[in-house]
Interface confidence: low
């Protein structure tokens, strides 16, 4: 069937359109185009005879039409009047006619639109604004954009006048945005330039910053006021109701207590005509005095005296704070605070209570610290220490003894020999000693402030012959693979060589054996049961030598994994079962038995007479060494056959 296709269907003014013919019949005489939906000679555009290839314009020919041999019609420089139907009349060679109608629509090329507004400065929560998209164009669609987004759904937004008018009711500051309108028709789309809606608003209630309302005397007061407003607000300051200045900031240097009061900021918007105020109350405090600490006892005696530290001055409605060693007060039954925290009492002071101590006065603004103070705790003297620790000396050497005792103030020292006062010095020196210098040497330390004295007595033996040494031990019952043992050869003697023997042999080389303290001390690390031997120490100098009695090391070990004997596991019914358990252990372990998990007896030997198959099962021996705290066990299966 003959059809006409318009390409394009919607044509912009000034462009061209092709009326394309489809299914054109064969053996044609010619064809003719008409304006409209029927064949009307008065509205013929052009005719075409195929045989002569002659095109003849008709009454409706405008000079813009071109006919093609395939009967298609091109119309150029389209005008609005070209809109409508076009009919093709085809005359076949057999003079049978055929008709087809096509159509197209002509639209103008849209101009760039613009936005007009009925109110260039609307007031928030009061005015409405109507935006209109210009120009008014027929057959055009109107669209609106806010900040390049399509219109939000809002009861305050209304489209009218075929969407050409956008009305914003009761505008708010949030409506301050970029607005664009767009016109569309089938052949073009154009957007306007942005229009920024300038909403007048405010002022809101002003904000005064900073927020703090308490100041110290002598500080600078610098207040700033801000209120959201369009156009920006004009500011005024009032102090206690009296106008001060028309600025956004209020600055008062070096304030005093007299500057306390109510500070009002007023914000004014000249366009909206509105005023808003905010009031803040400023309190100026006098600078508190720097606190200091007084003590009721300048020289307390350790373990005797109490000390009361008081934070001065006394101020009403003030919080007192304390620090010791730069930290808040520790919880201690020896520390007591008065009800107002102003007095800190140290009960029964010790030498560790020296401090430093600080107190503080807290007001609304800050904490003022005192200078730190340290307590002078009188202590000691502790038991004096006499050095060196030698007790045996050879005749002819010099004896030089020094005494020291922890004490505050420093101790005064006295020396006595066999109870007779010698001298009041910290050191005692006797040159070229003889056997007559043997005796009891006493150091007496005296603290003149506390009145306390302590003494230490040392026995000095002057002899060419060395005494028989003895061995002292720091651990009489070491545990295997756990403990170390240090043997020390006594006494400590000057210019003496120390020697050691184990089971009558010189010391073996071992990483577990270590000599120290001039060979006077022998340390055995990680002792084993094999270290349970006889140890002897010896001392010698150029004129004599001597050996100690042997000391046998008692090493606690075990229990090892026990052994159940006899090894048999199969028995005949009616036989006697006699099981014995043994485990290497020092001291001997405690034994217990379990049969099939059920506890039996606490003996080393388990005896059952005339056993039967009912005695089949697991027999477990448990061993425990109370000294080492270790346990062990073994399980044996017994089968009794009938």
């Amino acid at each position: 069937k003959l059809t006409i296709e318009s390409t394009p269907f919607n044509v912009a003014e000034g462009k061209e359109v092709l009326l394309l013919v489809h299914n054109l019949p064969q053996h044609l005489f010619g064809y003719s185009w008409y304006k409209g939906e029927r064949v009307d000679g008065n509205r013929q555009i052009i005719g075409y005879v195929i045989g002569t290839q002659q095109a003849t314009p008709g009454p409706a020919y405008s000079g813009r039409e071109i006919i093609y041999p395939n009967a298609s019609l091109l119309i150029q420089n389209i005008i609005q009047n070209d809109t409508g139907f076009y009919t093709l009349h085809v005359i076949k060679s057999d003079l049978v006619n055929e008709e087809a109608t096509g159509q197209f629509r002509v639209y103008p090329e849209l101009p760039k639109p613009s936005i007009s507004s009925n109110n260039s400065k609307p007031v928030e929560d009061k005015d409405a604004v109507a935006f209109t998209c210009e120009p008014e164009t027929q057959d055009a669609t109107y669209l609106w954009w806010v900040n390049n987004q399509s219109l939000p759904v809002s009861p305050r937004l209304q489209l009218s006048n075929g969407n050409r008018t956008l009305t914003l009711f009761n505008v708010t500051r949030n409506d301050t945005a970029s607005y664009k309108c767009e016109t569309q028709n089938p052949v073009s789309a154009r957007r306007s330039d942005s229009v920024i809606l300038n909403v007048l608003y405010g002022p809101d209630a002003p904000t005064i910053s900073p927020l703090n309302t308490s100041y110290r005397s002598g500080e600078n007061l610098n207040l700033s006021c801000h209120a959201a407003s369009n156009p920006p607000a004009q500011y005024s300051w009032f102090v206690n109701g009296t106008f001060q200045q028309s600025t956004q900031e209020l600055f008062i240097p070096n304030i005093t207590v007299n500057n306390s009061g109510s500070y009002t900021c007023q914000a004014h918007n000249s366009d909206t005509g509105l005023n808003r105020t905010t009031v803040t109350t400023i309190t100026v405090y006098a600078e508190p005095p720097k606190p200091f600490i007084t003590s009721n006892n300048s020289n307390p005696v350790e373990d005797e005296d109490a000390v009361a530290l008081t934070c001065e001055p006394e101020i009403q409605n003030t919080t007192y704070l304390w620090w010791v060693n730069n930290q808040s007060l520790p919880v201690s039954p020896r520390l007591q605070l008065s009800n107002d925290n102003r007095t800190l009492t140290l009960l029964s002071v010790t030498r560790n209570d020296v401090g430093p101590y600080e107190c503080g006065i807290q007001n609304e603004l800050s904490v003022d610290h005192s200078d730190p103070v340290i307590l002078n705790v009188l202590y000691g003297p502790d038991d004096p220490t006499i050095s060196p620790s030698y007790t045996y000396y050879r005749p002819g050497v010099n004896l030089s003894l020094s005494c020291h005792a922890a004490s505050n103030p420093p101790a005064q020292y006295s020396w006595l020999i066999d109870g007779n006062i010698q001298q009041h010095t910290q050191e005692l020196f006797i040159s070229n000693i003889t056997e007559k210098n043997s005796g009891l040497y006493t150091c007496q330390a005296n603290n003149s402030a506390s009145g306390h004295s302590r003494t230490t007595v040392k026995t000095i033996t002057v002899s060419a012959e060395l005494p028989k040494p003895s061995i002292s031990s720091n651990n009489s019952k070491p545990v295997e693979d756990k403990d170390a043992v240090a043997f020390t050869c006594e006494p400590e003697a000057q210019n003496t060589t120390y020697l050691w023997w184990v089971n009558g042999q010189s010391l073996p080389v071992s990483p577990r054996l270590q000599l120290s303290n001039g060979n006077r001390t022998l340390t055995l690390f990680n002792v084993t049961r094999n270290d349970a031997r006889a140890y002897v120490c010896g001392i010698q100098n150029s004129v004599s030598a001597n050996r100690s009695d042997p000391v046998t090391l008692d090493v606690l070990y075990g229990p090892d994994t026990p052994i159940i004997s006899p090894p048999d596991s199969s028995y005949l019914s009616g036989a006697n079962l006699n099981l014995s358990c043994h485990s290497a252990s020092n001291p001997s372990p405690q034994y217990s038995w379990r049969i099939n998990g059920i506890p039996q007896q606490h003996t080393q030997v388990l005896f059952i007479a005339k056993i039967t198959p009912n005695n089949n099962g697991t027999y477990a021996c448990f061993v425990s060494n109370l000294a080492t705290g270790r346990n062990n066990s073994i399980v044996k299966s017994i089968t009794v056959s009938a």
């Epitope: 200091f292 600490i293 003590s295 300048s298 020289n299 530290l309 030498r351 020296v354 401090g355 430093p356 101590y357 200078d371 730190p372 103070v373 340290i374 307590l375 002078n376 922890a406 004490s407 505050n408 103030p409 420093p410």
Partner: nanobody, 124 residues
């Protein structure tokens, strides 16, 4: 008459060391806490270190802890300040001070006797 005489000051390069001494006379030295203070030009006198009468406790300002060591020899009536790893900001007039039994101040308050000072200059 009580006298405190400082010595040992001088010019030293950054990172260097100095040992200040303060000899005391006219007082029972072993009953006094001894302190060192310093004063830089245009600044207040500040605490450096203190040592109590027995020598068992010492106290230091944070700015010198670990670099300066205070010690005393009661037999010689002398207190010392060993200054290591010196810095330009250590430049000051260093004073020796004595305080009798009682709460020990880590500030100028409470020190009864003062020396004339010895100048320490740390400069490259």
């Amino acid at each position: 008459e009580v006298q405190l005489v400082e010595s040992g000051g001088g010019v030293v390069q950054p990172g260097g060391s100095l040992r200040l001494s303060c000899a005391a006379s006219g007082l029972t030295f072993s009953t006094y806490t001894m302190g060192w203070f310093r004063q830089a030009p245009g600044r207040e006198r500040e605490f450096v270190a203190a040592i109590i009468w027995s020598g068992s406790n010492t106290y230091y300002a944070d700015s010198v802890r670990g670099r300066f060591t205070i010690s005393r020899d009661n037999a010689r009536n002398t207190v010392y300040l060993q200054m290591n790893s010196l810095r330009p900001e250590d430049t000051a007039l260093y004073y020796c001070a004595a305080q009798h039994f009682g709460p020990i101040g880590l500030t100028t308050r409470g020190y009864h006797y003062w020396g004339q000072g010895t100048l320490v200059t740390v400069s490259s």
